[in-house]
Interface confidence: low
């Protein structure tokens, strides 16, 4: 697995994007929770599993860079000491990580106060606890539960040296009621410590949810450069205890230049 290369052209268009949330092509509106729940649980294992097992799908938001800076608490330079950050996990539970200026340098980010109900947002982490981002607005999460009412259209066109999924588009409609207990798989989170045992906090588009830690043989993402995970849009959890993310040995070639990585025993 690899993180998207900087040169890889990635365009994500979400139908729900509010007009006011234009700007960066990767920073539209939150693709709400229920379309993003992914599990690494393996079902229907085929007969003898000689090696690689299942393959996860996990989740991620685009790199931060926020169009609507600041929270709802007006803070002056006198009483507010900016805390630099790279991602939301580094901030408090009532904060999110973003550029402090509209359209500002994404490389300069600080922890900003979370946004209260009915305020504009672009991902769940921007909203204060008890709320989540839906259609660009922070709405109540109904006692930490989420009701699935989504209609999104995502068209992704990827440039990749090793071919692409051209025209890979997906239309997802979810209108069934689905409830998720806080900390369980699918729950919105800020950091992995918010998730139950065996889960990590990972992102999918603009959401961050609890996802299962990867098992042996599952496809994992090996980050070549520090910070490259910020370019992912479907982040995967890390490999479980006793496992590491390593290149899958090619049975037919001596070279190990393949980019396919799986969780393997140390």
């Amino acid at each position: 697995m690899m993180a998207l290369g900087a040169a890889g052209a990635t365009r994500v268009f979400v139908a729900m994007v509010a007009a006011a949330l234009g700007g960066h092509p990767l920073l539209g509106v939150s693709a709400t929770l229920n379309s993003v729940l992914n599990s690494n649980a393996i079902k229907n294992l085929p007969p003898p599993l000689g090696g690689a097992a299942g393959h996860p799908g996990s989740a991620v938001s685009a790199a931060p860079g926020i169009l609507y800076p600041g929270g709802n608490k007006y803070q002056t330079i006198d009483n507010y000491q900016p805390y630099p950050c790279a991602e939301d996990e580094e901030c408090g539970t009532d904060e999110y990580c973003a550029s402090p200026t509209r359209g500002g340098d994404a490389g300069v980010q600080i922890c900003l106060a979370c946004r209260k109900r009915r305020k504009r947002c672009m991902r769940h982490a921007m909203c204060c606890p008890g709320n989540y981002c839906k259609n660009g607005i922070c709405v109540s999460s109904d006692q930490n539960h989420f009701r699935g009412e989504i209609e999104e259209t995502i068209t992704e066109s990827f440039g990749n040296d090793h071919s692409t999924l051209d025209g890979y588009s997906r239309r997802t409609t979810l209108s069934s009621k689905m409830y998720h207990t806080k900390g369980q798989e699918g729950s919105v989170c800020l950091r992995s410590s918010d998730c139950a045992s065996g889960l990590c906090c990972a992102r999918h588009f603009w959401s961050k949810i609890c996802k299962p830690v990867l098992k042996e043989g599952q496809v994992c993402t090996k980050h070549r450069r520090k910070g490259s995970h910020g370019l992912e849009i479907f982040q995967r959890c890390y490999c479980g205890e006793g496992l590491s993310c390593r290149i899958q040995k090619d049975h037919h070639q001596a070279s190990n230049s393949s980019r396919l990585h799986t969780c393997q025993r140390h």
């Epitope: 990749n160 993402t221 992912e232 479907f234």
Partner: nanobody, 121 residues
Framework: EVQLVESGGGLVQAGGSLRLSCAAS????????MGWYRQAPGNQRELVAS???????NYVDSVKGRFTISVDSAKNTVYLQMNSLKPEDTAVYYC???????????????WGQGTQVTVSS
């Protein structure tokens, strides 16, 4: 019940082509295809082509430039186009996908039953 069914395998001469299909059926809300694996006799199962965390595709070195993974989301189907087949491509090919089903109201990882590809020299 959700099922993944592969088809398109068969016997082909070296240099020939096959197109494998993997169709998901059942109470599917969202189909998230992951990749194709293969297992040759006496070998471990290996990942052949996968959809990356960034949504692109990656291939094991031995099939690069010959195999192409693609998806038809409307049909809940993932394909593996295999060109310039070689005898060493002979194996049982399995598809793998994460599926959110309305019956289970959860994401689960599913495997197909496998389809045999035999390349004769």
């Amino acid at each position: 019940e959700v099922q993944l069914v592969e088809s398109g395998g068969g016997l082909v001469q070296a240099g020939g082509s096959l197109r494998l299909s993997c169709a998901a059926s059942g109470s599917i809300v969202t189909f998230n295809p992951m990749g194709w694996y293969r297992q040759a006799p006496g070998n471990q199962r290996e990942l052949v082509a996968s959809i990356t965390s960034g949504g692109g595709a990656n291939y094991v070195d031995s099939v690069k430039g010959r195999f192409t993974i693609s998806v038809d989301s409307a049909k809940n189907t993932v394909y593996l186009q295999m060109n310039s087949l070689k005898p060493e491509d002979t194996a049982v090919y399995y598809c793998n996908a994460d599926i959110f089903s309305s019956s289970r109201l959860s994401w689960d990882n599913y495997w197909g039953q496998g389809t045999q590809v035999t390349v004769s020299s």
